[in-house]
């Protein structure tokens, strides 16, 4: 901000002046520039007990310019804001407050959170989900021969991180107990990995072995993504009798 | 000593034009405000619009469509004319001045004109 | 536009008393308010502009406080010609407005 403070140079009529300094158009010993050039604006500035009138290019923080026909002064913004485009609509909050629609609240709406980075109140963002990949081959220790029982894995991926308060994520990991034909290895074989092992790792933190609570195994097997080829369905028809017991990781 | 002296028809009829001037000494009208505010007898004061120094014009958004203030700084006058009036229009006319936020609103007024509003 | 409420409306002192009129802004006018004195038949005449700041002539007896939304005219002592109506004038932004007025009447 540039300021102007005024001294009376030619005498207009008691206690007023024009062709004062700077940006002031007219001015008095005592009290500074009474009023501004064009574009500028008038603002008070505080020195000790005494409030003296200056111009300015701009407004400092907690006011905004107002413009009338010749006439322009900076004005405060409401007591609870920082910076504002007008009375009515404020940028930016004072500590505490967080900003909505150019309005300074004590808490978020329904619906909205604080985000205490940006002290803003924010749509709440839910976690989003992919579909389920297709499960892995039947696989035991690694390997995709050589066992009748092992077990087989599906993963998806998280499309969209929640918010402080959005619903957390569901598993993005299932495993369940399979059966094979036992078959034995052919040479090289041994120790194959399981197509998806080589496909993806698990997420940093994810426990492969964490067992998740009756609802999301019931949800699990809704799942219609849970698509088999023909190979696999006849494998299954095995376990009829068994359960099918899954693993799932929860994020 | 500034002085400002408001002079115009004192009756004027319903749905016609009030008109009013305001001549002012010891001050040009090319610096400073030169407003209007007027007082409906035994109710408070309302402040009407001004013209600045170069001419330009405010008025109270409650009067807009009704009012004009304009200038003529060769007779160092402003005048104000207020449309379609009705009796709610009767009241004192007053000009006042001010030159700017840091010095007195309205440090001068003149006497006020009464304006009476009637068939 | 900002509102502005003056009280009381009327009040009735002796010589000497002290006299306080207060008026409240419906929003923050950072200390841009003015105090008027007027008389019968008369225009009104400023006495205090800038909340506190006297105009050349006005008596010290009055003087005038206040900040945000509350503002104050205090006459320190009352004098026979200090009865009249005071209206307080608010002028933060456009359209400017008045206050209702208090009338001071002799006791």
């Known amino acids: 901000q540039n300021a102007s403070r005024g001294r009376r140079q030619r005498r207009m009529h008691p206690n007023v002046s024009q062709g004062c300094q700077g940006g002031c158009a007219t001015c008095s010993d005592y009290n500074g520039c009474l009023s501004c050039k064009p574009r500028l604006f008038f603002a008070l500035e505080r020195i000790g007990m005494k409030q003296i009138g200056v111009c300015l290019s701009s407004c400092p923080s907690g006011y905004y310019g107002t413009r009338y026909p010749d006439i322009n002064k900076c004005t405060k913004c409401k007591a609870d804001c920082d910076t504002c485009f007008n009375k009515n609509f404020c940028t930016k909050c004072k500590s505490g407050f967080y900003l909505h629609l150019g309005k300074c609240l004590d808490n978020c709406p329904e619906g909205l959170e604080a985000n205490n980075h940006t002290m803003e109140c924010v749509s709440i963002v839910h976690c989003e989900v992919s579909e389920w990949n297709p499960w892995s081959p039947c696989t035991k220790k690694g390997k995709t021969c050589g066992f009748k029982r092992g077990t087989e894995t599906r993963v998806r991926e998280i499309i969209q991180h929640p918010s402080a308060k959005g619903n957390l994520c569901p598993p993005t990991n299932e495993t369940r107990k399979c059966t094979v034909q036992r078959k034995k290895c052919q040479k090289g074989e041994r120790g194959k990995k399981g197509r998806e092992r080589k496909r993806k790792k698990p997420n940093k933190g994810e426990s492969k072995e964490a067992i998740p609570d009756s609802k999301s195994l019931e949800s699990s097997k809704e799942i219609p993504e849970q698509r088999e080829n023909k190979q696999q369905q006849k494998k299954r028809k095995v376990q009829d009798k068994q359960k099918s017991v899954s693993v799932s990781t929860v994020h | 000593e500034v002085q400002l002296v408001e002079s115009g028809p004192g009756l004027v009829k319903p749905s016609e034009t009030l008109s009013l001037t305001c001549t002012v000494s010891?001050?040009?009208?090319?610096?400073?405000?030169w407003n209007w505010i007027r007082q409906p007898p035994g109710k408070g004061l309302e402040y009407m619009g001004y013209i600045s120094y170069s001419g330009k014009t405010y008025q109270n958004p409650s009067l807009k469509s009704r009012i004009t203030i304009s200038r003529d700084t060769s007779k160092n006058q402003y005048s104000l004319k207020l449309s379609s009036v009705t009796a709610a229009d009767t009241a004192v006319y007053y000009c006042?001045?001010?030159?700017?936020?840091?010095?007195?609103?309205?440090?001068?007024w003149g006497q006020g004109t009464l304006v009476t509003v009637s068939s | 536009d900002i509102q502005m409420t003056q009280s009381p409306s009327s009040l009735s002192a002796s010589v000497g008393d002290r006299v306080t009129i207060t008026c409240k802004a419906s929003q923050d006018i950072d200390s841009y308010l003015s105090w008027y004195q007027q008389k019968p038949g008369k225009a009104p005449k400023t006495l205090i502009y800038l909340t506190n700041r006297l105009v050349d002539g006005v008596p010290s007896r009055f003087s005038g406080s206040g900040s945000g939304q509350d503002y104050t005219l205090t006459i320190s002592s009352l004098q026979p010609e200090d009865f009249a109506t005071y209206y307080c004038l608010h002028y933060d932004e456009f359209p400017l407005t008045f206050g209702q007025g208090t009338k001071v009447e002799i006791k």
């Open positions: 010891g001050d040009s009208i090319t610096s400073g405000y």
């Open positions: 006042a001045t001010y030159y700017g936020y840091g010095g007195p609103w309205f440090a001068y």
